[in-house]
């Protein structure tokens, strides 16, 4: 969310549209600040694990869950559509017992029809003592796998086991992978789509298939569009995240499913155990994987992954490290933007492109990843636009 | 006065196609939910679409994929698009507006159109 | 989905008389219920929304109440005008479902 890292002071945040900043009093309060009006469509968020719906308080420059009380599935809908999902994709809403807050946003039901968030009162009561939890899009559930396999030296993924994986193809090749966020939109990396392969035109997507030769040309999706992060840098591979479009959208089943997007609350820990999955190549300098892999990983704190020893301060916060400081096990050539996961509740969410590394599996060389966490407000955010 | 005004029903075939129009006065069309909702001879109300303000779409499963709810602001036109007609989507068919989109009651109701799929 | 049904689904009553219509709800929603009246040839017209507000033109002889799975619809002096059919609809949650109607006519 834009509250945090923006180039405004601690008491101002930044318009997308024009960079300058404006009051937190005057976000959310019902009236266009920002020249594109995106202080008034950036209001909502789902938080935690748990996907509380928080509501952005003009009046106490802060976030606050949405008390139960006369909810309903209408303005659900509602908060995952200004999210930037479409109506289609909403998928359910559950009730979560948040007896620890003491301060809510409530509905008004005789506000009229006038938007969610003037609909939406200030109240240190909440009578259910229950908080709405949403879900937009039914995301982060696989086929249960328990076989372990590795990219580097290892075996193949189960069917429906990374439902979310894409292969990305141009002109009937394997280039990068990618994670299917929801029916129309695929995340990648931004180093994925330098130019001249920005073209969207040059793009084919592979969904719920796990060897490269049934991918031929009848069973792809054409990419509509290409939108690489705008402040991608090359060099360094910072902000190393890409989104696509599809022109037709996905069908979803047992093979083809979208990854949960995490949620800002999400706290993870080092030494999390996560999982990377591609057709990248199965040892350094060698050749593209004809069937899908996949590995178990551990994230690495971005200090240790910094140190002199091992990137040497080329980690920045929008990258995540992960692998294993022995090597062994590690993403390689052609599985870049593709998933780095974990799984948490029960739900696996996305917590990483795959971005660069010195090597395949080398010791002291781990994978590293685009830190999805810090890229979720400008996903939904371009997804909003394209609304 | 707000005043809502079906048009396009008639006699089809199964398997064919009809174009329902509904046209709205009296009030700011554009910032109103809109659904259709239809009702056989004798029979109950069922509902069969609704298309929000910002132009999202909902469907029954009864009619997903064979009906296209649509709207056109500039026209203060709502449409329902029927393709694959059968036997059982004969019905008067009423478009109505949402008086609040977040309580999902429906305020005024047009006098309805018939649709009749026989052959 | 969630179910709607009414009782009773017919009745005889005569001006004056107070009448009463409930309709249950298969799921808990909430205040989300909706009442409408229609006349044979007619579209249908709201008379209660969200549980127990009146629309604005309807006699306040008409009243609703409830709010989770039951709700009811009462009519404290029956007019002449209000011999009709009254159907109950959750707008809770899709797909937004009416109930099957209760159809009240002169004794």
């Known amino acids: 969310w834009k509250f945090m890292g923006s180039k405004c002071s601690n008491s101002g945040i930044e318009c997308d549209s024009s960079g300058t900043c404006i009051n937190p009093s005057n976000w959310c309060d019902g009236v266009s600040h920002c020249p594109g009006g995106e202080d008034e469509n950036r209001c909502v968020r789902l938080y935690g694990p748990n996907f509380i719906l928080q509501v952005y308080s003009s009046q106490r420059k802060s976030w606050h869950p949405v008390c139960q009380d006369d909810w309903n599935e209408n303005y659900g809908r509602a908060a995952c559509r200004d999210m930037g999902y479409k109506n289609n994709f909403y998928s359910s809403q559950g009730i979560v017992d948040d007896s620890g807050s003491t301060s809510f946003m409530k509905l008004n039901t005789s506000a009229g029809n006038v938007d969610i968030y003037k609909k939406l009162y200030h109240s240190d009561a909440c009578s259910s003592k229950a908080v709405v939890s949403l879900r937009c899009i039914a995301c982060g559930v696989n086929l249960n796998s328990s076989r372990q396999s590795r990219i580097v030296g290892g075996e193949s993924a189960l069917p429906g086991a990374w439902p979310w994986q894409v292969s990305l193809h141009v002109q009937n090749v394997h280039v990068c992978g990618g994670s299917i966020i929801t029916p129309e939109w695929i995340v990648t990396a931004a180093h994925c789509v330098e130019k001249p392969l920005n073209n969207p035109w040059h793009w084919t997507a592979f969904a719920g298939i796990l060897r490269q030769s049934f991918m031929f040309y009848g069973a792809g999706y054409q990419v509509e569009k290409v939108i690489s992060h705008p402040n991608y840098d090359s060099k360094t591979k910072n902000n190393d995240i890409a989104l696509m479009k599809l022109q037709k959208p996905l069908t979803f089943n047992d093979l083809v499913k979208p990854v949960c997007l995490p949620n800002p609350g999400m706290m993870l820990q080092p030494e999390q155990l996560c999982w990377i999955s591609g057709w990248g190549a199965t040892e350094e300098k060698g050749k593209t994987s004809e069937v899908l892999n996949a590995a178990k990983v551990l994230l690495i704190e971005t200090q240790r992954c910094n140190s002199r020893y091992v990137y040497d301060n080329l980690i920045t916060p929008a990258m995540i490290c992960a692998g294993f400081l022995q090597g062994n096990v590690d993403s390689c050539q052609g599985d870049s933007g593709g998933p780095l996961v974990t799984s948490k509740n029960n739900i696996w969410w996305l917590i990483g492109d795959t971005s660069w590394g010195s090597g395949c599996a080398k010791a002291y060389r781990p994978g590293v990843y685009g830190n999805v966490m810090v890229f979720t407000d400008w996903i939904y955010r371009q997804m909003r636009a394209d609304g | 006065e707000v005043q809502l005004v079906e048009s396009g029903g008639g006699l089809v075939q199964p398997g064919g196609s009809l174009r329902l129009s509904c046209e709205a006065s009296?009030?700011?069309?554009?910032?109103?939910?809109m659904h259709w909702v239809r009702q056989a001879t004798g029979k109950g109300l069922e509902w069969v679409s609704a298309?929000?303000?910002?132009?999202?779409?909902l469907y029954p499963d009864s009619v997903k994929g064979r009906f296209t709810i649509s709207r056109e602001n500039a026209k203060n036109s709502l449409y329902l698009q029927m393709d694959s007609l059968r036997a059982g989507d004969t019905a008067v068919y009423y478009c109505?507006?949402?008086?609040?989109w977040g309580s999902g009651y429906l305020d005024y109701w047009g006098q309805g159109t018939l649709v009749t799929v026989s052959s | 989905d969630i179910q709607m049904t009414q009782s009773p689904s017919s009745l005889s009553a005569s001006v004056g008389d107070r009448v009463t219509i409930t309709c249950r709800a298969s799921?808990?929603?909430?205040?989300?219920l909706n009442w409408y009246q229609q006349k044979p040839g007619r579209a249908p017209k709201l008379l209660i929304y969200?549980?127990?507000s009146l629309q604005s033109g309807v006699p306040s002889r008409f009243s609703g109440s409830g709010s989770g799975t039951d709700f009811t619809l009462t009519i404290s002096s029956l007019q002449p005008e209000d011999f009709a059919t009254y159907y109950c609809?959750?707008?809770?949650?899709?797909?937004?479902?009416f109930g099957p109607g209760t159809k009240v006519d002169i004794k």
């Open positions: 109505a507006r949402v008086g609040d």
């Open positions: 009296g009030f700011t069309f554009r910032s109103y939910d």
């Open positions: 298309i929000g303000s910002a132009g999202d779409t």
């Open positions: 799921q808990s929603i909430s205040i989300y």
């Open positions: 969200v549980a127990s």
């Open positions: 609809q959750q707008s809770y949650g899709t797909p937004f479902t």
